[in-house]
């Protein structure tokens, strides 16, 4: 008789997710020398201990601090990069501006960076058929409750001047409920923190409004001011020219507003 | 098995550039880090650059930071190197390597190496 | 940059004899350190990685010693099919860089 297998909204386990978590450990290691004391076979059992047999809506960051442990990186403090639903252009501007670092630049993040897992209470099955969903299910899910722990620890660490690409396309530029709203705002520390710098990427070829003055940015400036960081906002109009400009500075057209 | 097998030689003008391919077979192309080597006719081995062709990142050797460019087809499973404003000192073998994860960061598979010509 | 520097460039030796070549780096590597077998018209063979550990179907006539900046390859007894250049390679940061080579001979 097949066992009765709980069904949820969200889509299951990435395919090969032990293997490509494994993968990633080592490519890290490799591409980052300083991380090569990293035992990969242990953050992998450290990652899987996080999930495995324990019921999917009931993960705690608890849960996820052994891999923590093992996953510790020094990144400098005040060249973080934090970003809200513009991922792709966030890493494309720390792969030229390599000083620079996104939560995904880091080891945990760049291990889980768009994978989905979880697994079943009491059996030690990954369940490739489906995942709780953050919303229509329920909130401490694997991911979701791995994303918020990493993220608070990231935005725990920065210091001085923390710059954040927003998505000037979108209705809501500034989302209280996204990662960066809910979590990384609230955790960035003012007695490191100087200021926070917004960037607001334009998306029409002709949008040359002034984005820094949308509600939702105004409403990130007052959660900031209050907890006594200073903002600050630019808006980039032009991002391709603003890659380019990061990339090859000294040429002529990069005086200009971007 | 693993095999990583790159594109016929080439023999190109002073100035212009060229493309070599690496395809990757045996194995999941995203997995591995592709490095990318050459050597000039009696010459020593020079790194150039690596891919991680599950993202696209790159990083290359300082002496070729403006001239080159690896890019990766992950559909094809194949790895590119580009080299532009090529002059006689480009003249090399060009090969493809990669690392077995098992053998520290070695190069443990190597492509069967592409020879570049530059005349003027 | 990492330099390496190989001793001797050039090694005459006979099949049967016991020979070893040296690998200097300019700062410490620790055992970040791979060799190769090289012969004419083909692509680098691993034989050493981590500084002392036999790549896979390696004979184990071949060996790796050393740590920081000082590493020894030996061949403790030379075979026919040896004779071929051979190249030091550190792993330990980028850009990852080569010894300049041994071009070992038949006496």
């Known amino acids: 008789v097949p066992r009765w297998r709980q069904q949820w909204s969200g889509p299951g386990t990435t395919k090969r997710f032990p293997e490509t978590v494994l993968a990633r450990c080592v490519k890290y290691t490799e591409i980052h020398p300083e991380m090569r004391h990293v035992d990969c076979q242990s953050v992998w059992d450290a990652f899987k201990g996080a999930f495995i047999s324990k019921h999917p809506c009931n993960i705690t960051e608890e849960d996820y601090q052994p891999l923590m442990k093992l996953g510790t990186q020094t990144v400098p403090c005040n060249k973080i990069l934090l970003w809200s639903r513009i991922k792709d252009l966030a890493h494309q501007f720390t792969q030229v501006q390599r000083d620079m670092f996104t939560l995904e630049d880091t080891l945990l993040g760049y291990l889980a960076d768009d994978l989905t897992w979880c697994g079943e209470f009491n059996t030690s099955k990954i369940n490739y058929q489906s995942c709780p969903d953050w919303r229509k299910d329920c909130s401490n899910n694997p991911v979701s409750v791995f994303w918020k722990t990493v993220s608070r620890r990231f935005a725990e660490a920065a210091c001085d001047v923390v710059h954040v690409m927003l998505n000037g396309s979108r209705s809501k530029i500034f989302d209280k409920n996204s990662t960066f709203g809910s979590v990384e705002v609230h955790n960035l520390q003012p007695e490191k923190v100087q200021t926070l710098e917004a960037w607001v990427i334009h998306g029409g070829r002709e949008d040359s409004r002034d984005l820094c003055q949308d509600p939702t940015i105004k409403e990130l400036e007052s959660i900031i001011s209050k907890r006594n960081i200073q903002f600050s906002c630019k808006n980039i109009y032009r991002p391709d020219k603003f890659l380019q400009c990061v990339k090859n500075p000294e040429d002529s057209s990069c005086t200009s507003e971007i | 098995q693993m095999q990583l097998v790159q594109s016929g030689a080439e023999v190109k003008k002073t100035g212009s550039s060229v493309k070599v391919s690496c395809k990757a077979s045996?194995?999941?192309?995203?997995?591995?880090?592709m490095h990318w080597v050459r050597q000039a006719p009696g010459q020593a081995l020079e790194w150039m650059g690596w891919i991680d062709p599950e993202y696209g990142r790159t990083d290359y050797a300082q002496k070729f930071q403006d001239r080159v460019t690896i890019t990766a087809d992950r559909s094809m499973s194949t790895a590119y190197m580009e080299l532009s404003s090529l002059r006689s000192e480009d003249t090399a073998m060009y090969y493809c390597?990669?690392?077995?994860?098992?053998?520290?960061?070695?190069?443990?598979?190597w492509g069967q190496g592409t020879l570049v010509t530059v005349s003027s | 940059d990492i330099q390496l520097t190989q001793s001797p460039s050039f090694l005459s030796a006979s099949v049967g004899d016991r020979v070893t070549i040296t690998c200097r780096a300019s700062e410490d590597i620790y055992s970040n350190l791979a060799w190769y077998q090289q012969k004419p018209g083909k692509a680098p063979k691993l034989l050493i990685y981590d500084a002392n550990s036999l790549a896979d179907g390696v004979p184990s006539r071949f060996s790796g010693s050393g740590s920081g900046t000082e590493f020894t390859l030996t061949i403790s007894s030379l075979q026919p099919e040896d004779f071929a250049t051979y190249y030091c390679?550190?792993?330990?940061?980028?850009?990852?860089?080569f010894g300049q080579g041994t071009k070992l001979e038949i006496k």
């Open positions: 045996g194995y999941t192309f995203t997995d591995y880090i």
């Open positions: 390597a990669r690392s077995a994860h098992t053998t520290g960061f070695g190069f443990a598979y």
């Open positions: 390679q550190q792993y330990n940061n980028y850009p990852y860089t």
